[in-house]
Structure formats: C-alpha cells, structure tokens
Interface confidence: low
C-alpha cells in the first residue's frame, strides 16, 4: 500500500545558478528500512520498462553508493526518516522536478519536488504594513524565498540609499515546512520619510550586491506648515495693515480645512490661506497661528506674535496704603495700558506737577499731613503722551495738633 | 480521519480567567500548527495568533498579547489557549485550527467544533 | 494591519440564481515573487465552524463544487456562485494570508427566499 509512505518537505525551492539548495526532508516507510535512493531530474515512467527514466543525479543501494559524476549532489539522509538532499553548487538546468525515488524490502514511492533557478539571484520581497504615520513605529520585513547552509547571504536596509542604522533581526528558517530568510527592521518614520525609497538589498558573504526590491514609503502626516508675517517683524501700530499667509509645505493625505486661530481661539470666518487686518487696533495683539487639517489629524503653525503699539491710554493711580498714618510710608503706582511700555512719567499732586518724579512709582518714605490730597499721572511712550487720569486720594490721619481750650 | 476536540462551554466572572482545551488526534501532532480564532456573537472571525507544538515558537496578534497565552502538551497532544482579566468583550466562541503550510503559505486546514465562553458577573 | 471589506453584508436570492459578492483588502495581496493572491473565501454555515472553500484567490478546495468560483487580484476579489441550492445558506468570509494578522472580512449572509 503505497500510501504508508509520509513526505514533507517545502514543495517549491528557490535558488540562482552558482547558489545551493538545501531540501529540508522527512520521510516515513513503515514497513520497513529504506533499501536503495535514486535522486532523479524530471523523471518520466517508461511504461514499457515500469520504470523512471531521467537524469540520475544520485544513487545509493543497500550495496553501497555508486560514485557520482555530480559530487555536488549529496543526500543527507538516512533509512527511516532523513531525506534532506544538498545540492551544491545549483545550475540553471537543475530547474525542474527532483523525483526521489525510494525502495523498501516490499514498498516503493516517487516523490517528486520542485526546483526553481533562476539565471540571476531573484530580489527579496519588502512587505509594508497597510498604513504607516508619522511617529508610529513599524516593522519593515524583507523576505527572500531562499537559505542554504552553503551559501551565506546578508539582507540589507537602505533609505535613499544609504544604510539604515537601526538594528535589524535576520531570521532564517531551513525546515520542512519553509525555506526562507527575513530581516525585519523596526522604524518610527517622520513625515519627512514621505515619498522615500527604502530598499531591501540581498548581499552575498562578502557584500557584494546580488538583488534588491524597494518600495516609496507613504507616511500619512498631518498638514506641515510655514507661516509668513507682513511686516516680517509683525511689530505695527494702531491703524496699520497686516498680512499673514499660511504655506503647506507637505500634508499627506491631502488638506480638507483651513482655519486661523488667536491666542488658541478660532477666528471666525477666516478661511483661506490669507489672513488680512485692515485698520488694526490694540485688541488684535496676540499669537497667531494657522491650522490645517486632514484625515489624520491637524497641523498647526509656529505662532507669530503681533504686536499693535499705541500711546499710553489714560493713566489710573494706585495708592499703597491710603488712609496712610502720619509718619508712615506710602507708595503711588501709576498704571497706564501702552505699547511700547511707558519711559517717562510725570507726577501731580493736587494738580501741580511733582518736580523730579519721572518713575512708575513713587515712594514716599514719611508721610506728613501736608501729603493729603489728589495723585494723578501722565504716561508717555514713543508714540505720545496719554492723557490724566481722575488720579486718587490719599488721606492723612495724624493726632490732634496746636489743641486750643474754648 | 483528523479531528479536533474543544472542551465545553464555559460561563465565568468578570476578571478571572480561563484555559480552553483542544486535542488532536489523527495526525502528528508536531507538524501542525495551531491556530486560534475568536467570533464574538453574530460577527466576523478575528485571529488570535499561532503556536507551534514541535517547538513551542508562539506569533500573536498585537490585539491579543497579553490577554491571550498559548501553550501545548506534547504528549496528550493538546494545545491550550489561557485568556486573563475576562471582561464582557471576551465572551464569544473560540476555534482551534490545525494548519500545515508550505513555504508559499497556503494552507491545508482543520477546524474544531469551538468553545463557547460567556463572561458575566 | 490589513482591512478586508465585504459587500453585499447579507442578500436574498432564490434557488437557481446566480450571486456573486465582493472582497476589498486595503493593500494588495499579490505577491510579486509568485504572482500568487493570498487570499481564501470560508463558508461558515448555521451553528457549525468555518470550511475553506477557495485560496489563492482561485484554487477550489477538493470536494468544492464548480458553482462556486473565486476571482480577482490585487485588492479586489469576488465569489460567484453560479447557481445557488439550499445547500449555500450560510455566511461567506474572505481572508488574507499575505501577512501577519492573518485578517477576515466581516461576511456576507446569504439568504434563500
């Protein structure tokens, strides 16, 4: 019963001429010890002869093995189990069938394997994940449909040709059920990855170049952009105009939205790549920036900060502590909204201008009751003089003075 | 004749776990991975991962690693699938299938009769 | 990982008639070193496990019947079942092997009327 016989081995095996080909192979014959091996190429049954003809690359018999022409050809196996076959070197006509024609005591089988060689070293297989964004790591594998124990080879990764400098794992795998070597390259890619060609390149001992597959990375980012500010110093004054133009530099998928956002607040109804302010006031100061969006996510500019300068808005003032105690310290503070800050102050007390009182605060160390009475300021900048406030009291407590008896 | 034989259904509590039972026979145990699949009620097949017995290698998909173990017995040539933390997500029915694959990777295939598992409190 | 998309998600056809639905993966299943599609369709009828019934796109398992057929390459790929018994309800699923995790579409239910 011919179906006591129990192959396995990979059913197509893959090499290049002057390469090898090791054919992992097991086997059961459970009626007994393998008597004679022949290793046929492309065997055909003579129905006249009941037997194989065909190109006997090996032969072995309970006798002995019969010399081989082809020392290239060795079978590696054993009489109950082992029919790993090793052919080395490998040539161009070896494609074709490998029949291994087995014979027990009472039993014989034909097994036949495929064997492809091709005339040059076939290209590794890149296989991406189905989508690869930006910052995400992946793993890149690289696979090739060949290992020989005879015939070390090396899988390289290049970006854009040059060597990828993390470390890859290469596995191999010389078994019955698959014939392979895979490098596998783990890899955070950066938007600007996008559109490179990363190749996978097969290499013998020596580093030599054999094949190479590559494939054009399509990293999906969102929108990456570049903002530009007319006047470029985004410095103006009440009244000017401002410009700002919002450029994508990549975005993968395409953009979908545009919008414009200050101080992290979305404008309303600004909506193209254009931002104009006519006419600017103080109000329209702040951080600028665009935002574009795509199916990944969105993109934001670097923020421009505008500065809208003014001269000072009319001053306050504010008293620390008032009512103050005779002999105590007091200090005025004169507040005025400006842009640029105010350099010049000038102080006024009941009216009358404070000689040689040109700061922000004024201190006054002692307080007498002479100092009771109405604080105002004036604050000026290099756009003018703003304008005086309501100014603030500050009342004096001190004990009774010159007491007279009535 | 190749069968494969799931061990019953199973109603557990939420955050315990439980090992469900798939055991060969008909064929050389070794030389056949063993895949595990899920189907939650009235939907599709998700793939669990793969273990294989001849020498305990394991490859699982990212969606199951660390709720999912996958582990074998040689010699009563069963494989085991461990889930942990069981939630409600969890309950569905769950396959073993044996796979041999060539090098190509296509793939003769058999299927035990799934494990019910239901996970509630 | 890759998305396998199936349409019709269920239909409704009578004894006799032909139906065919589709598969849609999210990158290609062919591969380029064997020219061959990774891809199955399983038929997973009521109450039972999942059967293969087509892989490499287009091979039939043994003891498929010729009704059913496989087609398509790349990322689109389609089962025709030319005409349809009582014997086909059931829910359809395609499958990709191209790579690791092995992904199911989501089925199609035939129904008989």
């Known amino acids: 019963d011919s179906s006591k016989w129990v192959f396995e081995h990979p059913e197509t095996l893959y090499a290049w001429e002057g390469a090898c080909v090791w054919i992992p192979c097991t086997y059961r014959a459970l009626d007994g010890d393998l008597e004679s091996f022949i290793l046929f190429h492309n065997p055909e049954y003579n129905k006249n002869t009941s037997k194989f003809d065909g190109t006997r690359l090996y032969e072995s018999t309970k006798d002995g093995k019969v010399p081989s022409e082809q020392k290239r050809v060795q079978f590696l196996g054993d009489k109950n189990k082992n029919c790993t076959l090793s052919i080395h070197p490998v040539h161009l006509n070896d494609s074709g069938q490998l029949g291994l024609r087995m014979e027990s005591k009472t039993e014989k089988w034909m097994e036949r394997i495929h064997l492809n060689v091709s005339e040059r070293p076939f290209p590794p297989h890149i296989q991406l994940p189905p989508e690869i964004q930006e910052s995400q790591e992946v793993t890149l594998t690289c696979l090739l449909n060949f290992s020989c124990y005879g015939y070390p080879i090396q899988l390289q990764w290049l970006l854009e040709g040059v060597p990828m400098r993390q470390a890859a794992v290469t596995s191999t795998s010389l078994t019955i059920k698959s014939v392979f070597t895979r490098s596998e390259l783990k890899f955070s890619p950066q938007w600007s990855h996008h559109g490179k060609i990363v190749t996978c390149q097969l290499q013998d001992a020596d580093g030599k170049f054999l094949s190479n597959d590559t494939v054009q990375l399509n990293v999906k980012h969102t929108p990456k952009l570049e903002i530009k500010v007319t006047p470029s110093d985004a410095i103006v004054r009440e009244g000017d105009s401002v410009t700002m133009t919002c450029e994508v530099s990549s975005s993968n998928p395409e953009y979908t939205t545009v919008s414009w956002l200050k101080d992290g607040t979305s404008l309303k109804k600004q909506n193209t790549f254009t931002l104009n302010l006519r006419e600017v006031t103080k109000d329209q100061s702040g951080k600028y920036c665009c935002q574009v969006s795509n199916d990944v996510g969105p993109g934001r500019s670097e923020e421009v900060f505008l500065q809208v300068q003014y001269a000072p808005e009319p001053s306050t003032v504010q008293i620390l502590h008032s009512p103050a105690v005779e002999g105590s310290q007091v200090e005025f503070l004169c507040m005025s909204l400006a842009n640029p800050l105010p350099t010049n102050y000038t102080w006024y007390h009941n009216g009358k201008e404070m000689q040689g009182r040109t700061e922000e605060k004024v201190h006054i160390p002692k307080i007498l009751p002479w100092h009771a009475g109405t604080y105002s300021c004036v604050a000026e900048n290099i756009l003018g003089t703003g304008q005086r406030g309501p100014g603030a009291e500050l009342d004096v407590q001190y004990p009774p003075k010159k007491v007279t008896t009535v | 004749e190749i069968q494969l034989q799931q061990s019953g259904p199973e109603l557990v509590k939420p955050g315990t776990s439980v090992k469900v039972s798939c055991k060969a026979s008909g064929y050389d145990f070794t030389r056949y991975n063993m895949y595990w699949v899920k189907q939650s009620h009235g939907k599709s097949l998700e793939w669990i991962g793969y273990i294989d017995p001849y020498n305990g290698d394991t490859r699982y998909n990212q969606k199951f690693k660390g709720k999912a173990t996958l582990t074998v017995d040689k010699s009563s040539s069963t494989a085991y699938m461990h889930l942990n933390s069981l939630t409600s997500e969890d309950s569905a029915v769950y396959y073993c299938?044996?796979?041999?694959?060539?090098?190509?990777?296509?793939?003769?295939?058999?299927w035990g009769q799934g494990t019910s598992v239901t996970v509630s409190s | 990982d890759i998305v396998m998309s199936q349409s019709p998600s269920s239909l409704a056809v009578s004894v006799g008639e032909k139906v065919t639905m589709s598969c849609k993966s999210s990158q290609s299943l062919l591969y380029s070193n064997n020219q061959k599609n990774y891809l199955a369709w399983y038929q997973q009828k009521p109450g039972q496990s999942p059967k293969k019934l087509i892989y490499?796109?287009?091979t039939r398992e043994s003891g498929v019947p010729d009704r059913l057929t496989g087609s398509g390459s790349g990322t689109d790929f389609t089962l025709t079942i030319s005409s349809v018994t009582a014997e086909d309800l059931a829910v359809y699923y395609c499958q990709q092997f191209y790579s690791y995790p092995w992904t199911f579409g989501g089925g199609t239910k035939l129904e008989i009327k």
């Open positions: 299938e044996a796979i041999y694959y060539d090098m190509e990777g296509y793939a003769l295939d058999y």
């Open positions: 490499w796109a287009s």
